[in-house]
Interface confidence: low
Amino acid sequence: KKVVLGKKGDTVELTCTASQKKSIQFHWKNSNQIKILGNQGSFLTKGPSKLNDRADSRRSLWDQGNFPLIIKNLKIEDSDTYICEVEDQKEEVQLLVFGLTANSDTHLLQGQSLTLTLESPPGSSPSVQCRSPRGKNIQGGKTLSVSQLELQDSGTWTCTVLQNQKKVEFKIDIVVLAFQKASSIVYKKEGEQVEFSFPLAFTVEKLTGSGELWWQAERASSSKSWITFDLKNKEVSVKRVTQDPKLQMGKKLPLHLTLPQALPQYAGSGNLTLALEAKTGKLHQEVNLVVMRATQLQKNLTCEVWGPTSPKLMLSLKLENKEAKVSKREKAVWVLNPEAGMWQCLLSDSGQVLLESNIKVLPTWSTPVQP
């Protein structure tokens, strides 16, 4: 007996061939001997089966002795043995219809679980293997679970169902909802404008939800909500914004925030959360701000940084085109009685300069100039 595997919702074509290459009488029946369809001369006739409106044949093939049974919009319950009667012969075809669905929405938040459920006909014992977009293979029976979805799990999952040494392939598009970056750090000189960007790692037709940026300034004892906003069909509207600092928010995606100027009291860490409509849980992105200030007071030239710096970062003070006068893994360095010239304060990581502030030291009778 020939076995054919079909996919729920798809169309299948069961073949039946006569030895004579001409149009002759044929009938397709199910295992209960109920007629599905056949012919009367050049006309297609249908029987009283449940497939009535979904069954068809390809009349153009009859003259070649081919009498296919086409079943559209397959259902699991269409799984059956179908019998083609032609030229006093009977050809039997076993059709097994499978379905594979994601347990919930195919748009899932980063960190959530994906469960794929296989629908199969009674008596079948299929095995399933799925391959994620990042090439990870998972095997299972009626259900397959993947916990802690990552950004790389976004894309097309290819699942193969094996039964009777035949296979059928399913493709399911999964969208992992997340920000492109889990964390970012911005380095700015005091007084500079600060741009924070929160690009999303997915695109959807309509995006609705609400968000908030909580900020923990290094100098503050507790965190503070800097801005709350709504997102409606990808359009951003601010609900509440603190007076200090007065953030400006872009009205279009990607989410974009502007801090008019970097000040030591703003240095710290923020957490932007985005709650999407009809989704449980929130998207998160951490953002950090490091602020540098170079000053000269009387005979002391000081360079300071505020904010979440790594212990391996080096802070240096050097006269332009000269060796560093002072270089420490600390958040403040200074030089007493600095000589006149353009001094550079540098924050660097393994020799790579992350932030630089210049201050001009004038001869002792003058006051310093900050370019």
Epitope: Q248, M249, K252, H256
Partner: antibody
């Protein structure tokens, strides 16, 4: 020099169509939302439509929805306004303008305008 | 749509005068408002963005203030070239809405 130059205006009968163009130069056109704004004779300014950097989002004032279509060709640094089913009340000078990057930043660069007259 | 009410619709003043034009929004719009100057036969020119930020190249005699629903444009000392029509623009949400305009004339 940052510049916007409109063209395509003219006299058209009610119910007719017209296509306005705006050529941009001196800035990265594909990085900006763009708007069309019009001004009827002796009247104030009215925002008509705008379009996202990549053309994927478009917004219109209610009075032109379904009749006007804003589009852009970033390869040609050009903005367009296809105007169909024109009415007498569409008579105006049409300006193309560069949208500011953030809400509240308005439109910072404008063209000189092109005149559309709808009359029988 | 949010309505913008600009006043006065016209204003006569002399060179050296200090003048203020106001715009009121029908609901709170933070500081998402710009001010424009337009001279006859010319395109509008952005003066103030985000309610109070002076656009590059605009003289410092122009200033803007306000947030929420009430906004104002002030010209501290009128110059001959300032006689024009002024518009406020809300671009907080769609549709963008201009005020009706204020025509500033020489007294």
């Amino acid at each position: 020099e940052v510049q916007l130059v409109e063209s395509g205006g003219g006299l058209v009968q009610p119910g007719g169509s017209l296509r306005l163009s705006c050529a941009a130069s001196g800035f990265t056109f594909s990085s900006y939302w763009m708007s069309w704004v019009r001004q009827a004779p002796g009247k104030g300014l009215e925002w008509v439509a705008n379009i996202k950097e990549d053309g994927s989002e478009k917004y219109y004032v209610d009075s032109v929805k379904g009749r006007f279509t804003i589009s852009r060709d970033n390869a040609k640094n050009s903005l367009y306004l296809q105007m169909n089913s024109l009415r007498a009340e569409d008579t105006a000078v049409y300006y193309c303008a560069r949208d500011g990057s953030y809400s509240g930043y308005g439109m910072d660069v404008w063209g000189q305008g092109t005149t559309v007259t709808v009359s029988s | 749509a949010i309505q913008m009410t600009q006043s006065p619709s016209s204003l006569s003043a002399s060179v050296g005068d200090r003048v203020t034009i106001t715009c009121r929004a029908s609901q709170g719009i933070r500081n998402d408002l710009g001010w424009y100057q337009q001279k006859p036969g010319k395109a509008p020119k952005l003066l103030i963005y985000a309610a109070s930020s002076l656009q590059s190249g605009v003289p410092s005699r122009f200033s803007g203030r306000g947030s929420g629903t009430d906004f104002a444009l002030t010209i501290s000392s009128l110059q001959p070239e300032d006689f024009a029509t002024y518009y406020c623009l809300l671009d907080y949400n769609y549709p963008y809405t201009f005020g009706q305009g204020t025509r500033l004339e020489i007294k």
